[in-house]
Interface confidence: low
Amino acid sequence: AIVFIKQPSSQDALQGRRALLRCEVEAPGPVHVYWLLDGAPVQDTERRFAQGSSLSFAAVDRLQDSGTFQCVARDDVTGEEARSANASFNIKWIEAGPVVLKHPASEAEIQPQTQVTLRCHIDGHPRPTYQWFRDGTPLSDGQSNHTVSSKERNLTLRPAGPEHSGLYSCCAHSAFGQACSSQNFTLSIADESFARVVLAPQDVVVARYEEAMFHCQFSAQPPPSLQWLFEDETPITNRSRPPHLRRATVFANGSLLLTQVRPRNAGIYRCIGQGQRGPPIILEATLHLAEIEDMPLFEPRVFTAGSEERVTCLPPKGLPEPSVWWEHAGVRLPTHGRVYQKGHELVLANIAESDAGVYTCHAANLAGQRRQDVNITVATVPSWLKKPQDSQLEEGKPGYLDCLTQATPKPTVVWYRNQMLISEDSRFEVFKNGTLRINSVEVYDGTWYRCMSSTPAGSIEAQARVQVLEKLKFTPPPQPQQCMEFDKEATVPCSATGREKPTIKWERADGSSLPEWVTDNAGTLHFARVTRDDAGNYTCIASNGPQGQIRAHVQLTVAVFITFKVEPERTTVYQGHTALLQCEAQGDPKPLIQWKGKDRILDPTKLGPRMHIFQNGSLVIHDVAPEDSGRYTCIAGNSCNIKHTEAPLYVVDKPVPEESEGPGSPPPYKMIQT
């Protein structure tokens, strides 16, 4: 049987927004799912299409998507078919329309004192709220003989009079959104005694100290009065001008002339016409002072030959809007061609090297002119002045590899060593001209080096091999002072490298030959059994043909290595008593003894009165305190070797004797009693 796991459900939807009707089925065999709208199959479109077995709406349409949707699942083998529950959309929408005259039937029938009804043809679901406007001003209920309900389409003027004349518009809003009338209605009910606008003043923009003219005319029977006001409601007449409008003249035809305009004259001017009857008509116009700000700086630009590039000139803020044009070499650029101006942009198509130079963006309005230069460089591919050469560099000395190129702009040079980018550090330095300096050449610097010289137009590269000329040197240099243990076997190594493999030999510093029990085997001095006489100065000599010889001097000491005769023991002492840590060592040269207590060396010169190190090496601590507890290390050392041994010191409180214990009872642990 076919079972619906998910069925479509009725839902709210927004006009033009996404929606989804879900449908999921489960069946033993393959089924195909399709959708019905009011019983008819739904065809896939870009707007409405099957998404799996669900139906997806990219943009809900209130006309095409109204009705009942049903999901149908059909098993084509058995012919079994199952249908889901019905689902529909509650589509929310709003659509603009015109303001129309509903009553009377035609404009010709509109007379003063008749009832006029206008209808707002904005519709929507849910039903929108309506707002009416006359000449852009909102109308509300209870105002001068009209009836309006914010959610009703109709505006009724009863009776309509000249004061109702004007441009009627409506807007509606609902939870879905807002729309305003697509076409407005002009209601004109004449009353000769009402002032009517003949000529309305326009906003003007003038430069400082120029003159400005506002025109204003009304007509009525009898003729209306006309008055000009400035921002602060100050009347302007030829007899009484405000102090800041001394240069204002009102002409007989109603025009207002302002000469030598200053910043304080900028603002709103109102022209008021008043008929014998009816409301005053107030017309406003603004006087703006022309202004222009500075232009932002351009960054220099680098372009490549053959490309197309654009440079945008942002016009400075200004009033009126400044006009913008580009110039090059004092000539204004055309609006077409290879190098031309498009809007505010400088366009360079198929750039040539000759296009390089200074281009100037100009901006101008009544307030003045501004300009800003941009320097355009046309990049070229670098060319070689001197490529890096295969080089032999001496170890330990500075080495140089050249990479000299030229281009516009100045090329950037980077170096690679074994394909790895060389970053400048204490050993490598790249000079401004591209030359690489290796400050102190080392053997492993012998490898491939590659330099790359680049500009935005392209790059060139070359490589060279470095061979390091190794210096004759001991590897590693022998320690100048070494010890051998008396009566034991000993070896003293000496090795060296150079451009050619050096020969190595040992000799005594006094020139005498080595005794027969001492052998020199390929640079290793071997003592079969060390005697006292083996002590002394020896020289290791490394030599090859091209580089000569080098010498290393070694002083060999024969010693009896250190052993401890007495070692400190684990010691427990009562607080306030004296602790003795014994330590005695022997060896040749005679070892010196040092003590380390709690991780610091005890300096005999700074021990203070409580501590003392005896000649034989023992450490005594008087009046011990708990903080003296810890590990103490006895270190014995001479010029040949060093040895250490350690023991812990415990400081404990002295127990109070109980009555049962006699004075001769032993303490509960092994300890020193003083």
Epitope: L14, R127, T129, S150, K151, H173, A175, Q178
Partner: antibody, heavy 119, light 113 residues
Framework: EVQLVESGGGLVQPGGSLRLSCTAS????????VIWVRQAPGKGLEWVGI???????YYANWAKGRFTISRDTSKNTVYLQMNSLRAEDTAVYFC?????????????WGQGTLVTVSS | EIVMTQSPSTLSASVGDRVIITCQAS????????LAWYQQKPGKAPKLLIY???KLASGVPSRFSGSGSGAEFTLTISSLQPDDFATYYC?????????????FGQGTKLTVL
């Protein structure tokens, strides 16, 4: 986290003015109607005014002429300017966001700011 | 002026009880179902429970439900829990024509019996 935060409340004398701010974080307030609601001490909730996304504003009858709602989209903030304040305007003032673009019902509330009008 | 009448004004009940609060508008709502219910606890902002008359807000327990259309609406708590003792308000959306875009009920205070 989506939240509304009111500020600007405090003590003001009768006849004085106060401007409350409602700043949103986590949402763009310009996509929603914003509602101001007040609650006098121990009393119920009272609708003050609503500012729609298309810059239309409606006020409760008692608030008309004294209270003004405005918006600064760049600051994601809505303001309630209260003038000629009276003792009976003492209340916690909440700003709230509409449920969605298809309903004026309130979904999200601020925590409220207390306005006390007293001499 | 639009009036939203909530009843009862106060209500005492016990944990586990079924509670019904009604809200009646003096005129039809703007879109028949544009009503929401809120819960408020002392010193806190209201919290949305139900919107569009019957839709449960995110994170609200299923023991809360709403019904109604036009001008009469009901909030039901099927089995009262200790956390449910608070004040409940309805809020309706209207046409703005008479100056009322929104109107709250006067509130129902739910206390422990």
């Amino acid at each position: 986290e989506v939240q509304l935060v009111e500020s600007g409340g405090g003590l003001v004398q009768p006849g004085g003015s106060l401007r409350l701010s409602c700043t949103a974080s986590g949402i763009d307030l310009s996509n929603y109607a914003v509602i101001w609601v007040r609650q006098a001490p121990g009393k119920g909730l009272e609708w003050v005014g609503i500012h729609y996304t298309y810059d239309t504003t409606y006020y409760a009858n008692w608030a008309k002429g004294r209270f003004t709602i405005s918006r600064d989209t760049s600051k994601n903030t809505v303001y309630l300017q209260m003038n000629s304040l009276r003792a009976e305007d003492t209340a916690v003032y909440f700003c709230a966001r509409s449920f969605s673009d298809i309903s004026d019902l309130i979904k999200l509330w601020g925590q409220g700011t207390l306005v006390t009008v007293s001499s | 002026e639009i009036v939203m009448t909530q009843s009862p004004s106060t209500l005492s009940a016990s944990v586990g009880d079924r509670v019904i609060i009604t809200c009646q508008a003096s005129q039809s709502l703007y879109n028949n179902k544009d009503l929401a219910w809120y819960q408020q606890k002392p010193g806190k902002a209201p919290k949305l429970l139900i919107y569009e008359a019957s839709k449960l807000a995110s994170g609200v327990p299923s023991r809360f439900s709403g019904s109604g259309s036009g001008a009469e609406f009901t909030l039901t708590i099927s089995s009262l829990q200790p956390d449910d003792f608070a004040t409940y308000y309805c809020l309706g959306e209207f046409s703005c024509g008479s100056g009322d875009c929104l109107a709250f009920g006067q509130g129902t205070k739910l206390t422990v019996l």
